[in-house]
């Protein structure tokens, strides 16, 4: 959906936010041109980008919330999420600096769609909870907050240990959109009945 | 009301340091990230430096990064803006101003009237 | 970073005469269905004030007069029909990624 739009569409919201879902979570989108761009294309870096133990919340966690938790916890989550992906942002190098170095262009351009697409992603989910009546939840764009955000480890002047981190942060990222799939594929045909 | 007042300003030789606040009033402030924004007289805006609304993220234009630290008091309701190894193109009024967003950056709705600082020997 | 080229530099207009601001960015600020671009304004003596978001959504309190458009690399800021306290210097900004930049600024005047 666009800034500020909602549809009324129950179904065609929850194929959108399934379609986004299954877009976030290919790692061919974030995490693999992140890691050619950083120079961790290495078997033996590659095996220290590990998903940290309670980034974000689990798959059967997501399950157990109910619809309405759910998309608050969702909307939390993608709230870090965004800040996260402005900061190694601000670290990649610059256009200039990869074409002079061989690396692909293209990457860098992936790269910088994902916090578009996360925040599409999040309006979507503003609008779904706006369709199940969820007057808690804040609009994205706007001040405030959805819900409480546990506080975000504040990352690591070291180089190195940063790219292994949002090496990391982004393999959490790809399984956790991929738990949100799930969890989107179990909502029923209408946002009164859910499928088991 | 919604206000932002910035303070600190003055004259300062190069090399040195300087440190800016802006109290912020008539609204959740801990709620918002925040940003310094700058004007060197007669010319144009620049966007200087963004903290995330708990303070765990920082973000800053190029030629300040090493010089300038953004940070805030989320209990004091206090942004600062920590300038050293000042330079003479860095004499501008800086703008304290409140992002819309408060998880990431769209625009900023709410300004400050400035404080001059001057850089000069 | 992404240049902001804001033209014209500046501009005359009779009152109740219509004044077009345009803004080409050096690469598209549009990503994911949104417009990474706002407008502001700023009078002598005052800070910037913001009177468009997302290219085209009109801040609250922002007389109907002031509209933008655009998407990709070119926006416009359109004031249908001048008013005396519209004379200022107006701004674009981009928010697509870091470093945020501004435009050089369009003063309005009356001519």
């Known amino acids: 959906a666009a800034m500020g739009s909602c549809s009324k569409e129950y179904r065609m919201l929850l194929g959108q936010l399934q379609k986004q879902t299954d877009l976030m979570q290919d790692t061919s989108r974030l995490l693999d041109p992140y890691i050619r761009i950083q120079g961790l294309d290495i078997p033996k870096l590659r095996e220290h980008c590990r998903e940290s133990p309670g980034a974000f919340p689990s798959e059967e966690t997501l399950r157990g919330l109910g619809r309405r938790g759910f998309l608050q916890t969702l909307n939390a989550t993608l709230g870090r999420v965004l800040h996260r992906l402005a900061d190694l942002e601000q670290h990649l190098p610059k256009a200039q600096d990869l074409e002079r170095s061989g690396l692909n262009i293209e990457d860098l351009e992936k790269l910088q769609m994902a916090r578009p697409n996360v925040l599409g992603l999040r309006n979507n989910v503003y609008c779904m909870a706006q369709l199940l009546d969820n007057s808690d939840m804040t609009e994205p764009t706007k001040a405030g907050r959805g819900t409480p955000q546990p506080p975000t480890p504040t990352p690591t002047s070291d180089v190195f240990q940063r790219k292994l981190e949002g090496c990391s942060f982004l393999r959490g990222y790809h399984r956790f959109m991929h738990s949100v799939g799930r969890v989107f594929s179990k909502w029923g045909e209408s946002p009164n009945r859910s499928r088991r | 009301e919604v206000q932002l007042v910035e303070s600190g300003g003055g004259l300062v030789q190069p090399g040195g340091s300087l440190r800016l606040s802006c109290a912020a009033s008539?609204?959740?402030?801990?709620?918002?990230?925040m940003s310094w924004v700058r004007q060197a007289p007669g010319k144009g805006l620049e966007w200087v430096a963004t903290i995330s609304d708990g303070g765990s993220f920082t973000y800053y234009l190029d030629n300040v990064r090493g010089r300038f630290t953004i940070s805030r008091d989320n209990a004091k309701n206090s942004l600062y803006l920590q300038m050293n190894s000042l330079r003479a193109e860095d004499t501008a009024v800086y703008y304290c101003?409140?992002?819309?967003?408060?998880?990431?950056?769209?625009?900023?709705?709410?300004w400050g009237r400035g404080t001059l600082v001057t850089v000069s020997s | 970073d992404i240049v902001m080229t804001q033209s014209p530099d500046s501009l005359a207009v009779s009152l109740g005469e219509r004044a077009t601001i345009n803004c080409r960015a050096s690469k598209s600020v549009s990503a994911a269905g949104y417009n990474f671009m706002h407008w502001y304004q700023q009078k002598p003596g005052q800070p910037p004030k913001v009177l468009i978001y997302?290219?085209?959504t009109r801040e609250s309190g922002v007389p109907d007069r002031f509209s933008g458009s655009g998407s990709g690399t070119d926006f416009t800021l359109t004031i249908s029909s001048l008013q005396a306290e519209d004379v200022a210097v107006y701004y674009c900004l981009h928010s697509r990624e870091f470093p945020f930049t501004f435009g050089g600024g369009t003063k309005v005047e009356i001519k």
């Open positions: 997302w290219a085209s």
């Open positions: 008539g609204f959740t402030f801990s709620n918002y990230a």
């Open positions: 101003a409140r992002d819309v967003g408060h998880t990431t950056f769209w625009y900023f709705d709410v």
